[in-house]
Interface confidence: medium
């Protein structure tokens, strides 16, 4: 038996974090995002659930909808109609997948002060939204789209093809929701509310993933989801636009797919309304290195949508896949013809380009060895975007304004010097034409949300500064967080190290690597967090490190596309390289190194444990992918190509966790998975376990019955983190 090692933060009245603190969410922070309803007005749900109206210019504020009205139908969300006559109240929230959920909706008439009776909405509804003007309602019920001209009117049924697990109208199927759209909806109103565009997904030929949901009954029920795994048949997509003024006169009109896309399997990737009669559709080949942006116009005389060839813009990657995680969307200028878009420049860095006629003639607006990340708003004279340019830290986000009215355009960093130590990672929320905006800072200090004048960038007021959190953290010993870079050969890897309080470089500490490492992800970010790993550093004296290896985002395509067609290689090698560098720093106990990850991170941690390097004593994989053949087509094929002999089958086979089963013999491995994981199917862990058993390798495992990919139910989450804590403490010989 080895003597147990207990970490005791010395001589300080402050207390260490406890696991209970983390599980109870004691130190969670708040953000404040205004729900803009005009250039200078917004709504916000108060702490006590009143919906409050604010006017920035008159300083007026009042309750537009009381918490008692909300409570009367157990509402948890709301939506104001643009004419401000009605509010929908959302209740009976029932989660489906990552973004999708069903709910019951009630319409409240603000003028009459009562709920709208007659022609009430069916339940449960899959999606509901107001038109951008007036108070038309579009909603999806049982996979079909319905329209109401006014909340009290009878509904008009727009589609009739909807069928559970077969045809989806206005809402995405599983794979489009998770891997392409990242929304629960697939319908978009034109700016004036005349047209409604929607997508129809036909999943009739897609193989079904089936798994048991145990519930409380005598027999488990089976969940069936059309889920295309790598190489399988994909959804067939069609885009339609319906005139909502006369929906019964003319049916939905299909928008043509560009010829170069339609010639083989393809995806629809996004829709952007440009003006009331112009729409922009983005398409992607199944081999996701070619994307086509197609601008289409309404032809009154044909009553059809026309997408001329000269309005097709092709974006192609020669080194990997098109776009970042998703292909970026265009931000159109006032002229409704030209647009701004982020894509790779000749040096492989993602930057803003201005496209007036053709992509070939695009004018590069930003440049440098950093990346533009998101375009928030384009107005007549300004373009607001975020980037990681400032001081060369890829894990920061600052907001910039380019004055496009000037010639040449001038650039200003809006956020770089506001609260330099506290705030290095921002997002923003703009009013319609950017007359005002809110800045939300996520760290590295305590998050703070502020309101600003869109012309002068002056701070108007603090919306949320997390004072209570600041006070409650006063007597807590938080670890020290460092963000630095290490060099290996010609490569630079950014890492975040979380060091125990009273860290002493002359002592030796156990090391836990937390890894995600998926393509186009980023773990090393300058954000505030008090979570499980914070606790492990604070209370248990464990050094935590997160490393962004090759394949991660915002450092150029050379770094990003290094993993193209060979997942599971460099992500793992770079973690190993980093561990070796950390050992060289002198304060790591080489005999107590562990790695853990969830999802893609579970895949990487498993491969790292099975690397045969002997670097790790133990590790944990939660809900890991174990073979890219088991995962969704859109994701797997984006990065790996097809699992066919003439494409990339060999690497699909080589990169499985199962192929390395014998290499787990000299590590302690804890494998964890939820049985109702709709995303990374339990099959992945079942196959790892089978391979380990066949290789006669001992390992530990835990399943969570009826839990999905997030293992997020309160009891399960508590059990999970408690279990992982015990495992780690045992591995590191830390006493309980």
């Amino acid at each position: 038996l080895r003597p147990s090692r207990v970490y005791k933060p010395e001589g300080n009245t402050k207390r260490a974090l406890t696991l209970k603190d983390i599980l109870n969410g004691t130190f969670s922070y708040k953000t404040y995002f205004p729900n803009w309803i005009s250039e200078q007005e917004y709504l916000h749900q108060s702490e006590d659930d009143n919906i409050v109206f604010y006017n920035i210019e008159t300083r007026e504020s009042y309750i537009i909808l009381s918490n008692s009205t909300m409570k009367s139908v157990n509402a948890t969300d709301y939506g104001l109609s643009p004419d401000r006559q009605f509010v929908y109240l959302e209740s009976d929230y029932s989660k489906l997948w990552r973004y999708s959920y069903t709910a019951t909706y009630y319409i409240y008439d603000l003028q009459n002060g009562e709920f709208v009776r007659g022609y009430e909405l069916p339940r449960p509804i899959q999606y509901l939204c107001w038109s951008p003007v007036g108070s038309k309602l579009a909603y999806v019920y049982q996979n079909n789209i319905y329209l109401k001209q006014r909340p009290g009117d009878p509904p008009f049924q727009i589609t009739y093809t909807g069928r559970e697990n077969r045809i989806f109208n206005g809402i995405p199927d599983w794979v489009y929701e998770e891997e392409m759209l990242a929304t629960k909806y697939a319908l978009w109103w034109s700016p004036d509310g005349k047209f409604l565009a929607y997508v129809e997904f036909n999943d009739s030929d897609i193989p079904i993933i089936a798994y048991s949901y145990y519930g409380d009954g005598q027999y488990p029920r089976t969940i069936n989801i059309p889920y295309p795994k790598a190489g399988a048949k994909n959804p067939v997509v069609r885009v339609f636009i319906v005139d909502t003024t006369y929906p019964h006169h003319v049916g939905p009109m299909e928008v043509p797919v560009p010829e170069m896309i339609a010639s083989s399997d393809y995806y629809f990737s996004w829709l952007t309304w440009v003006s009331s009669e112009r729409v922009c559709l983005q398409w992607l080949k199944r081999v996701q290195n070619v994307s086509v942006l197609s601008i289409c116009d309404f032809r009154e005389d044909w009553h059809a949508w026309e997408c001329p060839k000269n309005q097709e813009h092709v974006e192609e990657s020669r080194t990997g896949w098109a776009g970042g995680f998703f292909v970026s969307t265009p931000a159109f200028s006032q002229d409704a013809t030209s647009y701004y878009k982020i894509f790779s420049d000749k040096d492989g860095y993602k930057h803003i380009h201005y496209i007036k006629d053709t992509v070939e003639n695009a004018i590069q607006i930003t440049s440098g060895k950093w990346e533009a990340i998101y375009i928030f708003r384009v107005t007549q004279d300004s373009l607001f975007y975020s980037s990681n340019e400032f001081e060369g830290y890829p894990g920061r986000r600052n907001i910039y304004r380019i004055s496009i009215g000037n010639s040449p355009p001038s650039k200003k960093c809006v956020t770089c010097h506001l609260r330099k130590e506290r705030c290095q990672y921002y997002t923003a929320s703009f009013s319609y034409k950017a007359k005002y905006y809110a800045l939300v800072c996520y760290g590295p200090g305590l998050p703070i949300s502020t309101l600003h004048d869109g012309r002068t960038d002056q701070e108007i007021q603090v919306l949320e500064e997390n004072k209570e959190l600041e006070n409650s953290l006063r007597n807590i010993q938080l670890p020290k967080v460092e963000i630095k870079k290490l060099k290996d050969g010609g490569l630079t890897f950014w890492y975040k190290m979380i060091l125990p309080p009273q860290f002493d470089r002359s002592k030796k500490y156990p090391l836990l690597i937390q890894v995600y490492g998926g393509p186009c992800s980023q773990s090393v970010k300058s954000v505030f967090a008090v979570n499980w790993i914070t606790y492990l550093a604070s209370k248990e004296g464990i050094v935590i490190a997160l490393v962004d290896g090759r394949g991660t985002a915002f450092q150029g395509d050379k770094f990003l596309h290094a993993v193209y067609r060979k997942l599971g290689v460099y992500e793992v090698e770079d973690q190993l390289t980093a561990v070796r560098k950390f050992i060289e720093m002198g304060f790591i106990d080489e005999e107590r190194i562990a790695i853990w990850g969830w999802s893609y991170g579970g895949y990487v941690s498993s491969l790292a444990l099975a690397s045969g390097t002997g670097l790790f004593k133990c590790g944990i994989a939660v809900a890991p992918v174990s073979s890219w053949e088991y995962y969704a087509s859109i994701y797997s094929e984006r990065f790996m190509g097809l699992p066919t002999k003439d494409d990339n089958l060999e690497h699909y086979k080589n990169s499985t966790v199962m192929a390395r089963a014998e290499y787990f013999r000299n590590v302690d491995y804890l494998l964890i998975h939820g049985t109702a994981d709709d995303n990374v199917h339990f099959q992945n862990s079942a196959q790892i376990a089978k391979a380990l058993v066949n290789a006669q390798v001992d390992f530990q495992a835990m399943w969570y019955s009826d839990q999905n990919h997030g293992i997020s139910s309160g009891r399960s989450q508590n059990h999970l983190y408690t279990h992982m804590t015990h495992f780690l403490k045992q591995c590191f010989s830390l006493s309980d």
Epitope: E573, T577, E591
Partner: antibody, heavy 116, light 108 residues
């Protein structure tokens, strides 16, 4: 049964080149770190080079850096050592070995003689 | 680089006797990173011990490893005729991996 079979050794003049191969069987080759270790006649063991499972990371002893190149073909379960600008002091039996920290399996070795 | 010094250079013993071989590192080496090998004339080396004290597959229990920091020991509790060979220690904590110069165990 794990087997490592080296080939490609022989007599070569100073400044010349040789390519050694090591055919692996009996274990899953693609994730395994592999190394070359040499032993001059009547002398001890000297580590020469190592390569990660994917081939993405390579490591060399200072004495061979810039002259030797380690590579692998996972589809053929084969490890290679390309030796250029050979010198008399490179004369040795070259072993291919599985591993990086501890070399748990070794080939029988192939003799490389550099002499004019 | 980390230099490993083995002693004695040669050990003359009879079958049945206990052999104690020493390996000293020029700087501290974590146990995880130390291995021992046996090599007989005309043969490739064979892994005996890894992680300073763990026996490799198929190695008889008369072979044991111990030590930490800079001093490591390989012990053969009762020498068998087939144990007469050259023994090398090896570290892989420092880059590059290095071997000791070897200890020859010969029949007295």
């Amino acid at each position: 049964e794990v087997q490592l079979l080296e080939s490609g050794g022989g007599l070569v003049q100073p400044g010349g080149s040789l390519r050694l191969s090591c055919a692996a069987s009996g274990f899953t080759f693609s994730p395994a770190y592999m190394s070359w270790v040499r032993q001059a006649p009547g002398k001890g063991l000297e580590w020469v080079s190592a390569i990660s499972g994917s081939g993405g990371s390579t490591y060399y002893a200072d004495s061979v850096k810039g002259r030797f190149t380690i590579s692998r073909d996972n589809s053929k379960n084969t490890l290679y050592l390309q030796m250029n600008s050979l010198r008399a002091e490179d004369t040795a039996v070259y072993y291919c070995a599985k591993g990086w920290r501890a070399f748990d399996y070794w080939g029988q070795g192939t003799l490389v003689t550099v002499s004019s | 680089e980390i230099v490993l010094t083995q002693s004695p250079g040669t050990l003359s013993l009879s079958p049945g006797e206990r052999a104690t071989l020493s390996c000293r590192a020029s700087q501290s080496v974590s146990r995880n990173y130390l291995a021992w090998y046996q090599q007989k004339p005309g043969q490739a080396p064979r892994l005996l011990i890894y992680g300073a004290s763990s026996r490799a597959t198929g190695i008889p229990d008369r072979f044991s490893g111990s030590g930490s920091g800079t001093d490591f020991t390989l012990t053969i509790s009762r020498l068998e005729p087939e144990d007469f060979a050259v023994y090398y220690c090896q570290q892989s904590l420092g880059y590059p991996p290095t071997f000791g110069q070897g200890t020859k165990v010969e029949i007295k």
